[in-house]
Amino acid sequence: EEELQMIQPEKLLLVTVGKTATLHCTVTSLLPVGPVLWFRGVGPGRELIYNQKEGHFPRVTTVSDLTKRNNMDFSIRISSITPADVGTYYCVKFRKGSPENVEFKSGPGTEMALGAKPS
């Protein structure tokens, strides 16, 4: 059985205020059944950054086409970066449950930090 891997290739992402940041996440299997969500931080206080199924995330867009079949690319773009956006971002696979989905596996995380301003 192919074990699911959550791949976040960049450990560190340097971003510029006002620009758009791309956070990469790919998976190696469609299983178990359930969604992928993005969070900033860990633990009970973590912040939900993107859930394609529900919620309103005006600054977030997906890299892959949302009509794509059997998608394994869960990368996102965050626009209009501000200093408040710094932190470590995790893509997290949930296993479908009834009524609640259960966290199954997290990516290793990508730290977003502010780089030098463009000259």
Epitope: L31, K53, K96
Partner: antibody, heavy 120, light 108 residues
Framework: EVQLVESGGGVVQPGGSLRLSCAAS????????VSWVRQAPGKGLEWVST??????YYADSVKGRFTISRDNSKNTLYLQMNSLRAEDTAVYYC???????????????WGQGTLVTVSS | EIVLTQSPATLSVSPGERVTFSCRAS??????IAWYQQKPGQAPRLLIY???SRDTGIPDRFSGSGSGTDFTLTISSLQSEDFGVYYC??????????FGGGTKVEIK
């Protein structure tokens, strides 16, 4: 070419058991969820069960009586049906699940079905 | 459980006519609707997913639309091979996956 071939159907008495099989080919079986959907004679479609990796899901009407399983080394899906009732009489279809976007499952390939008749 | 109601139950149509099928969900399912065609003695075949995306190899006379609770499948010009039963399915909230009761298309 994706192919799903069901077998194991037949006539069984109420309270009896039957095991259906579905042989899959033409796709990477181990990374997809697969399902059973049934259709009683002259009726519509009814979802029965879905299996992901080791995660399983059942319709209330079969919970506790039916067990879905898979053998990825044999590219085969199974449905063990116990305590069968007359209302379980149907054509049972094996279906490959497909996702769209970041979630959501529908059925993009179907087998031709195997008929299960529960009758005394 | 989300209930899908299809109407009408039966449609009598002549080849070449435009045909519209309705599927109404008991609650919001976003665009998480698929449509299937089933001919007598055959397995269902996927036509449309995500409410409006045609499956590979499906002729462009088939189109889907809608979001929320009201969905439509349209055949712009019915061909003789299009007769059969059409089902909608929701996958927004499951288990269980639910199907509509079907609309039968018969020759007028």
């Amino acid at each position: 070419e994706v192919q799903l071939v069901e077998s194991g159907g037949g006539v069984v008495q109420p309270g009896g058991s039957l095991r259906l099989s579905c042989a899959a080919s033409g796709f990477s079986f181990s990374i997809y969820a697969v399902s059973w959907v049934r259709q009683a004679p002259g009726k519509g479609l009814e979802w029965v069960s879905t299996i992901g990796a080791d995660d399983t899901y059942y319709a209330d009407s079969v919970k506790g009586r039916f067990t879905i399983s898979r053998d990825n080394s044999k590219n085969t899906l199974y449905l063990q049906m116990n305590s069968l009732r007359a209302e379980d009489t149907a054509v049972y279809y094996c279906a490959k699940d497909s996702t769209v976007g970041w979630s959501g499952d529908f059925f993009d390939y179907w087998g031709q079905g195997t008929l299960v008749t529960v009758s005394s | 459980e989300i209930v899908l109601t299809q109407s009408p139950a039966t449609l009598s149509v002549s080849p070449g006519e435009r045909v519209t099928f309705s599927c109404r969900a008991s609650q919001n399912v976003r665009s998480d609707i698929a449509w299937y065609q089933q001919k007598p003695g055959q397995a269902p075949r996927l036509l449309i997913y995500a409410a409006s995306s045609r499956d590979t190899g499906i002729p462009d006379r088939f189109s889907g639309s809608g979001s929320g609770t009201d969905f439509t499948l349209t055949i712009s010009s019915l061909q003789s091979e299009d007769f059969g039963v059409y089902y909608c399915q929701q996958y927004y909230d499951w288990p269980p996956f639910t199907f509509g009761g079907g609309t039968k298309v018969e020759i007028k």
